[in-house]
Structure formats: structure tokens, C-alpha cells
């Protein structure tokens, strides 16, 4: 007995053939032994099986002794065994359908599970084997559990159901609703204009919710909001600012977020949630804030770093053209009776520069 | 075990709509396909068409323009209409259970049919 | 549409004889038969299916025969309560079609 694989929803075509390339009469039938199709004189007639309506067959192939019978919108409940007569001869094909579906939502916020439920007829026993956009291959019988999603979850799950040494592939769209980036750090020097940005990982038609920017500055002992907004159809609207700083946001998305100025007491780290409508949990982004400031006083040049740095960084004072150098892994470098000339100040980690300011030393007579 | 019952109005009007509802009482509507057969006074049966829950319908080519079956699930009930009535639709209408099984396919629980009548 | 002849419209017949009535569909309808009887006022009700099974709970002296496009109904030995209409129904193609019925009237 063949055996076939076929996907819900999907249509599936059993084939049948003669051994004589003519037209002849012939009959698909259920293991109930009720009619589904069949041939009366040159016409295609029904019989009144459930699948009647959903049943057809290629009457173009008729005459070569072809006499396929294909079944629309496949339901698990089609699983069957079917029977083609033709030429005095029964042939049997036993039709299995599954259905492979997201359990919830297939637009899930990161850090949420996913499960693939498998629908399959009774007696079956399948296997599914999933692989995901990243090449995570996940295994499991009736139900597939990611407990966890990950930003690189999102895309296209190839899942393959594996039965009586035959397979069919289903394809899932997820989307794993995040940030591009799960933090990100801004650095500059005292009195720049600081731009954060808060790409979203995924497009959504319609986008509506709201956020906030809660600020742990790095002076303060306790955190603040900044800022709260609506987003409504991709239009974003302020709903409430601090007057301290008076940040700006951008109407458009990419969520877009002005500090008029860099100064040492903004400087630390703050957390935008995004609460999305109809979903349940939040989107997520750290930001960080590093303020550098160079000054002299008196006779002493110091540099110093204020926000959340690594202590692998390094906090450099460099004369221009000249070896004199202070180094330290620290947050603040001085110099004692520092050379005149152009000095900088370099925060770097690993050799790569990551902020830069410079202050002209003028020698004192 | 199962039992069905027609409803609807007994007098409909020429040109106007006929409309009847099949309430399946003491087992699922799901699974099965619905039949729709009318009797006029003193003739034999015509088949008029099924539906199932997943609304596949199937209806006699010679009252199809005219014919729309409907299912509803959550109430256990299936309904017929049959539009610009003339005095030939006038008969018992009875709405079956299609039951199919290995070698078996029948009309195995009938209402006790419904007479609509249409006149001005 | 295949059309389904039954004869005789109707027959008159006593208690204890031996009934026949034949149906003939207009095409090949394999063993796609099916024998209904209707009592007046009251809805159709199936006896015989596949043109020669006996329905659960239907008495054994109701049977039926046929193949292709004849087919045959018997009362081997009519009973009062057998005199009714006898509607014989295809349903090897849709639409489903019934015969024009066999009336049974005592005589």
C-alpha cells in the first residue's frame, strides 16, 4: 500500500494509472467503500463522500490512462485509505495529513516561548525535526517547545514531519518582537549633543503601544523617568517630558531620542520599555551614557569619565607629537605641571578609541 | 439519540424567501453532513442539498441559484432558504442526518418535516 | 442527474402475500442503493442500504437485491403495518436522487 504525506490546508493528488493509455472507467472510493469520484460516459461524477466537494480529478490525463484524484484544502480528518478502480484492479493509497501550528501568537516578545503543535491522525506516530532561522535544530513528537526566544529566532522554522519513512516540511513565520540591539552605549565628550536610537528587530503593519525612558544617573541614588510616549500606527507622540533634561523625540519611527547637551550629571544608564497593544510583557533596551570632561587647574590637567565603563577601559593623557603620556584603568588621569601644547584625552578599549577630547595647555610665564 | 426539529414559518408569500432552521437536540452537529428534502402534497421526495459544520455544502443543480444553507455550531442548529418562492415550493420540508459508515451511506434520522405553504 | 424508476406507482396487495418492486436507475450505480418507507405524515424511514443490507432493528422479511442499474425490493410476508409509500434513492452520484415511490395499499 502507498502511502502519502500530506499538509493541512494544502492539496494533495493520489495518483492512480492503467496499464492501457485510454480512456476507461474507473472510481476513487474511502475505505468506507463510499464514492468520492468517478467516470460516467465522458463526465466526472461525485459520489456523496465528505470529500466530494474538495475532490477532483485531471481530465486532461484521462486518455493517457492517468486517472490522479486530487483533494483541496486537505483536513486532517481526510486521513484515509482510498481506493482507485480501474480496470477490474484495486489500488490503495493511504492518505496522512498533518498540521503543524504556533500555539500562540506567532508574533511573540523576546524571552517568551514558542510551541509547535503537531495535528496528526489517529494511529499515527510522526516525528518532527524544526530548524531555526539561526540553524538551532530543535526535536520532539507532538509538541515542540523553545522555551526562550532569542532576536535571531525570528524568520522562517523549516519543521519536518517524518512518518513511515516519509516526509513533508512545513514552514513557520516567526517574529520575535525586540530591539536590534539589547544595549547599546553612547559616548561624548561634556556639551555635545547626545542621539540615542532604538531600531525595532521586526515591521510591523499596524504598531501601536506605549514607552518610557527610566534614567539611573550615575550621581543620583535613584532612578527617573525622562520621558513617557504613545505610538500609534508607526506616529510617535510625547506624552510627558522632564524638564531636566528636556530630551526630544523624534515623531518617526526608528524611536529617536535628543539630549540637548552631554553633561557629567546625565551621564549613567537607562532602560526604554515599549509596551506593545494586545501583547503581554515589554520591550526592552539599555542605553548607557558616557560623559568625558577635560580641564585644567591651576597646575594640574585632568581627564575624567563619568557613566558605566568597563574596567578593562583605559583613560589615557597624551601630549600631541610627543611621548608623554599618563595611562590608567581608571576614571580619572592627571597630569601635574603639564607641557604646554595640545593634549588629549582618549578613553579606548582594547587599542580602539572610543571617545576623544582634546585641551590646549598654554605655558604659564 | 439524536433527534431533529424543523422550525420556520408555515406561510411565505410568492417572490419572498423561505426560511427554516433544523435543531439537532441529543447528540453533535460536527462530523456529519446535514440533508435538506422536500415533499410537495401527494409526490415523492427531492433531494435539496447538505451541509457540514466546516460549511462544505453540496446542493441539487436545479434549485442551487436559489438555495443557501448555513450551520451554526454553537447552537446545534442548520438552516435553509430558498429564495423567490412560487407556489411549487409549497410541501413538507424535512431536514435528515447523512450517516456514512463502511458500506453504509443514509438518510438515518429524519425530522418530522416542516409544511410551508406559499401563498399571496 | 440519474433518474431512478420505480414500478408500479402502486399495488394492492393482503396480508401474508409476497411483494416485489423493482427501481431502475438511468446509468450504472453499482450496489449505490438505498430502500426508504414512508408511512403518511410521518418522515421516511430506511430500511435497506447498499441495496442489500437490512438496517439495524428493520424485520428480516424486508429485503433487497440488485446491482448496476436494477434493483429489487421484497416483503416476503406483508405485515399490516407494512402498507406505506416506498421510496428507493441513489447515491452513487450527486445530486441524490429518489424514485417517484411505490404506493402499497391493502387490497
Known amino acids: 500500500k502507498k502511502v502519502v504525506l500530506g499538509k493541512k490546508g494544502d492539496t494533495v493528488e493520489l495518483t492512480c494509472n492503467a496499464s492501457q493509455k485510454k480512456n476507461t472507467q474507473f472510481h476513487w472510493k474511502n475505505s468506507n467503500q463510499i464514492k468520492i469520484l468517478g467516470i460516467q460516459g465522458l463526465f466526472l461524477t461525485k459520489g456523496p463522500s465528505k470529500l466530494s466537494d474538495r475532490a477532483d480529478s485531471r481530465k486532461s490525463l484521462w486518455d493517457q490512462g492517468c486517472f490522479s484524484m486530487i483533494i483541496k484544502n486537505l483536513k486532517i480528518e481526510d486521513s484515509d485509505t482510498y481506493i482507485c478502480e480501474v480496470e477490474n484492479k484495486k489500488e490503495e493509497v493511504e492518505l496522512l495529513v498533518f498540521g503543524l501550528t504556533a500555539n500562540s501568537d506567532t508574533h511573540l516578545l523576546e524571552g517568551q516561548s514558542l510551541t509547535l503543535t503537531l495535528e496528526s491522525p489517529p494511529g499515527s506516530s510522526p516525528s518532527v525535526k524544526c530548524r531555526s532561522p539561526g540553524g538551532k535544530n530543535i526535536q520532539g513528537g507532538r509538541t515542540i517547545s523553545v522555551p526562550q526566544l532569542e532576536r535571531q529566532d525570528s524568520g522562517t522554522w523549516t519543521c519536518t514531519v517524518s512518518q513511515d519513512q516519509k516526509t513533508v516540511e512545513f514552514k513557520i513565520d516567526i517574529v520575535v518582537l525586540a530591539f536590534q540591539k539589547a544595549s547599546s552605549t553612547v559616548y561624548k565628550k561634556e556639551g555635545e549633543q547626545v542621539e540615542f536610537s532604538f531600531p525595532l528587530a521586526f515591521t510591523l503593519e499596524k504598531l501601536t503601544g506605549s514607552g518610557e525612558l527610566w534614567w539611573q544617573a550615575e550621581r543620583a541614588s535613584s532612578s527617573k523617568s525622562w520621558i513617557t510616549f504613545d505610538l500609534k500606527n508607526k506616529e510617535v507622540s510625547v506624552k510627558r517630558v522632564t524638564q531636566d533634561p528636556k530630551l526630544q523625540m523624534g515623531k518617526k519611527l526608528p524611536l529617536h531620542l535628543t539630549l540637548p547637551q552631554a553633561l557629567p550629571q546625565y551621564a549613567g544608564s537607562g532602560n526604554l520599555t515599549l509596551a506593545l497593544e494586545a501583547k503581554t510583557g515589554k520591550l526592552h533596551q539599555e542605553v548607557n551614557l558616557v560623559v568625558m570632561r577635560a580641564t585644567q587647574f591651576q597646575e594640574n590637567l585632568t581627564c575624567e569619565v563619568w557613566g558605566p565603563t568597563s574596567p578593562k577601559l583605559t583613560l589615557s593623557l597624551k601630549l600631541e607629537n610627543k611621548g608623554a603620556t599618563v595611562s590608567k584603568q581608571a576614571k580619572a588621569v592627571w597630569v601635574l605641571n603639564p607641557e604646554a601644547g595640545m593634549w588629549q584625552c582618549l578613553l579606548s578599549d582594547s587599542g580602539q578609541v572610543l571617545l576623544e577630547s582634546n585641551i590646549k595647555v598654554v605655558p604659564t610665564w | 439519540q439524536v433527534q431533529l426539529q424543523e422550525s420556520g414559518p408555515g406561510l411565505v408569500k410568492p417572490s419572498e424567501t423561505l426560511s427554516l432552521t433544523c435543531s439537532v437536540s441529543?447528540?453533535?452537529?460536527?462530523?456529519?453532513?446535514w440533508s435538506w428534502i422536500r415533499q410537495p402534497a401527494g409526490k415523492g421526495l427531492e433531494w435539496i442539498g447538505r451541509i457540514c459544520t466546516t460549511e462544505n455544502t453540496n446542493y441539487n443543480p436545479s434549485l442551487k441559484s436559489r438555495v443557501t444553507m448555513s450551520i451554526d455550531s454553537s447552537k446545534n442548529q442548520f438552516s435553509l432558504k430558498l429564495s423567490s418562492v412560487t407556489a411549487a415550493d409549497t410541501a413538507v420540508y424535512y431536514c435528515?442526518?447523512?450517516?456514512?459508515?463502511?458500506?453504509?451511506?443514509?438518510?438515518?434520522?429524519w425530522g418530522q418535516g416542516a409544511t410551508v405553504t406559499v401563498s399571496s | 442527474d440519474i433518474q431512478m424508476t420505480q414500478s408500479p406507482s402502486s399495488l394492492s396487495a393482503s396480508v401474508g402475500d409476497r411483494v416485489t418492486i423493482t427501481c431502475q436507475a438511468s446509468q450504472d450505480i453499482s450496489k449505490y442503493l438505498n430502500w426508504y418507507q414512508q408511512k403518511p405524515g410521518i418522515a421516511p424511514k430506511l430500511l435497506i442500504y447498499?441495496?442489500?443490507n437490512l438496517e439495524t432493528g428493520v424485520p428480516s422479511r424486508f429485503s433487497g437485491s440488485g446491482s448496476g442499474t436494477d434493483f429489487t425490493f421484497t416483503i416476503s410476508s406483508l405485515q399490516p403495518e407494512d402498507f406505506a409509500t416506498y421510496y428507493c434513492q441513489q447515491y452513487d452520484s450527486l445530486p441524490i436522487t429518489f424514485g417517484q415511490g411505490t404506493r402499497l395499499e391493502i387490497k
Open positions: 447498499d441495496a442489500s
Open positions: 435528515a442526518r447523512d450517516l456514512e459508515r463502511l458500506n453504509y451511506y443514509g438518510m438515518d434520522v
Open positions: 441529543g447528540g453533535s452537529i460536527s462530523t456529519y453532513y
